[in-house]
């Protein structure tokens, strides 16, 4: 008995072929002798199954003494034994119909976890193995969970179900809702407009939710919301903003918000939330601000940086063009009785500069002058 | 609901080969037979062969010796090379999909075979 | 190979009118028969199928009759949006093949 795997929703085609090259009477029959269709003459002719609106063939086909069962919209249901009666003799065929679903909705929030059932016909026993985006397989019997899913989860789950040595393959759009960054960090002398941009790893037609910009800064003993804001339809409208700082927002994606100035009282870390509608969850994305400033107070020229930067980070000031004369692994440094010229105040990693702020030391009668 | 998206060469010297791909979104692949059928600029329809997912083929004799038809299940897609063109295989080229009517239609490409 | 005629080449008729368009096959093809609707520029539409089973979406305006060799496409009250070619198509062998085309035009 041959045996054909078919996904529900799908269109099979169950094959039958007579030795003569030519249109004959066939006819095709359930497992309880239904009659499902076949000809007469040249007409196509269809019995009292439940299969009737769904079931078809091709009359091209008959005349090469081919006689299909063409099965549209599959269902779990519609496995069961076909006979093919052509030429006085009977061919058989077994179909069996699976289906793969997820168990919700395909769009997860990064974090969560995806449960994937298969419907199978009474009297299988079907191995599934899935293979996620990143090559991670994972195999199963009726359900396949994956917990966690990350951002590189998003994209398409290819699901091989095997039944009989035969194969059914499922394909699986999944979509994790996620920032495209976990965390971000931006570097501004003080006085600078700073931007922070919040794209997400995702595009759909409809984006609604609402989110929240909580501010940790390094000078304050707790933290506070610095704007709350709504998202409809992938525009964006503030709800609530505070006076200090009065933060301004893009009206459009990807979330956009702009600080007037870098000042050391604003320096800390930041955790943009965002709830989106119909999902359970938040998005997150940690936004951290480093701010420096450079001056020179009497004989002293000082260069300080706040927030949050890790210690391998070094701290340098230097005259332009000179070795540096001063280099610590700390956040503030300092140099007394500076040269007249152009200093230079770095904040480098491993050599790469992240920022640079430079203040002009005039000879000692002058006052300085920062540009 | 079931898309065909078709795309190729619109321009083409005598003697090239005519090469178009069909890519087929939401819906099934197996169990249908995907056609390709042409128009020359305003005449007729005319129907050059077809294919199902297993690879099995169809073609119209008149054009028999000069077509293949292929198929890549893994994209869903399926394919057309005419070899030899002259300037009476310009024509809009559609893909279709069938079993025994041709429903749906792709967008339709236009071929001009000139030297 | 079977071949399709259609007649009449071309028609014009009003909005509100009954149009006939016959499709003819040079040998029986029971009723394995298509009728197309295409406009300027864009591919066929399927109406009918199986001679005269209206596809789902099409307005019930339209309708097919005929088995054998002799086949017919109505159109019980014609609208604005029916202006175009028909195509007949016999699906009962290989190769398939479509009548020459019946255009539908305003009086």
């Known amino acids: 008995k041959k045996v054909v795997l078919g996904k529900k929703g799908d269109t099979v085609e169950l094959t039958c072929t007579a030795s003569q090259k030519k249109s004959i009477q066939f006819h095709w029959k359930n497992s309880n002798q239904i009659k499902i269709l076949g000809n007469q003459g040249s007409f196509l002719t269809k019995g009292p199954s439940k299969l009737n609106d769904r079931a078809d063939s091709r009359r091209s086909l008959w005349d090469q003494g081919n006689f299909p069962l063409i099965i549209k919209n599959l269902k779990i249901e519609d496995s069961d034994t076909y006979i093919c009666e052509v030429e006085d003799q009977k061919e058989e065929v077994q179909l069996l119909v699976f289906g793969l679903t997820a168990n919700s909705d395909t769009h997860l929030l990064q974090g969560q976890s995806l449960t994937l059932t298969l419907e199978s016909p009474p009297g299988s026993s079907p191995s599934v193995q899935c293979r996620s985006p990143r090559g991670k397989n994972i195999q199963g019997g009726k359900t396949l969970s994956v917990s966690q899913l990350e951002l590189q989860d998003s994209g398409t789950w290819t699901c091989t179900v095997l039944q009989n040595q035969k194969k059914v393959e499922f394909k699986i759009d999944i979509v994790v809702l996620a920032f495209q960054k976990a965390s971000s960090i931006v570097y501004k002398k003080e006085g600078e407009q700073v931007e922070f941009s919040f794209p997400l790893a995702f595009t759909v037609e409809k984006l609604t939710g609402s989110g929240e910009l909580w501010w940790q800064a390094e000078r304050a003993s707790s933290s506070k919301s610095w704007i709350t804001f709504d998202l409809k339809n992938k525009e964006v409208s503030v709800k609530r903003v505070t006076q200090d700082p009065k933060l301004q927002m893009g009206k459009k994606l990807p979330l956009h918000l702009t600080l007037p100035q870098a000042l050391p009282q604003y320096a800390g870390s930041g955790n943009l939330t965002l709830a989106l509608e119909a999902k359970t969850g938040k998005l997150h994305q940690e936004v951290n601000l480093v701010v420096m400033r450079a001056t020179q107070l009497q004989k002293n020229l000082t260069c300080e940086v706040w927030g949050p930067t890790s210690p391998k980070l070094m701290l340098s000031l230097k005259l332009e063009n000179k070795e540096a004369k001063v280099s610590k692994r700390e956040k503030a440094v300092w140099v007394l009785n500076p040269e007249a010229g152009m200093w230079q105040c770095l904040l480098s990693d491993s050599g790469q500069v992240l920022l640079e702020s430079n203040i002009k030391v005039l000879p000692t009668w002058s006052t300085p002058v920062q540009p | 609901q079931v898309q065909l998206q078709q795309w190729g060469a619109g321009l083409l010297k005598p003697s090239e080969t005519l090469s178009l791909t069909c890519a087929v979104y939401?819906?099934?692949?197996?169990?249908?037979?995907w056609s390709w059928i042409r128009q020359p600029p305003g005449k007729g329809l005319e129907w050059i062969g077809e294919i199902n997912h297993s690879g099995s083929t169809n073609y119209n004799p008149s054009l028999k010796s000069r077509v293949t038809i292929s198929v890549d299940t893994s994209e869903n897609q399926f394919s057309l090379k005419l070899n030899s063109v002259t300037a009476a295989d310009t024509a809009v080229y559609y893909c279709?999909?069938?079993?025994?009517?041709?429903?749906?239609w792709g967008q339709g490409t236009l071929v001009t075979v000139s030297s | 190979e079977i071949q399709m005629t259609q007649s009449p080449s071309s028609v014009s008729a009003s909005v509100g009118d009954r149009v006939t368009i016959t499709c003819r096959a040079s040998q029986d093809i029971s009723n394995w028969l298509a009728w197309y609707q295409q406009k300027p520029g864009k591919a066929p539409n399927l109406l009918i199928f199986?001679?005269?089973s209206l596809q789902t979406g099409v307005p019930s305006r339209f309708s097919g009759s005929g088995s054998g060799t002799d086949f017919t496409l109505t159109i019980s009250s014609l609208q604005p949006d029916d202006f175009a070619t028909y195509y007949c198509q016999q699906a009962n062998s290989f190769p398939y093949s479509f009548g020459q085309g019946t255009n539908l035009g305003i009086k």
């Open positions: 939401g819906g099934s692949f197996s169990g249908y037979y």
């Open positions: 279709a999909r069938l079993v025994n009517w041709f429903d749906p």
């Open positions: 199986a001679a005269s």
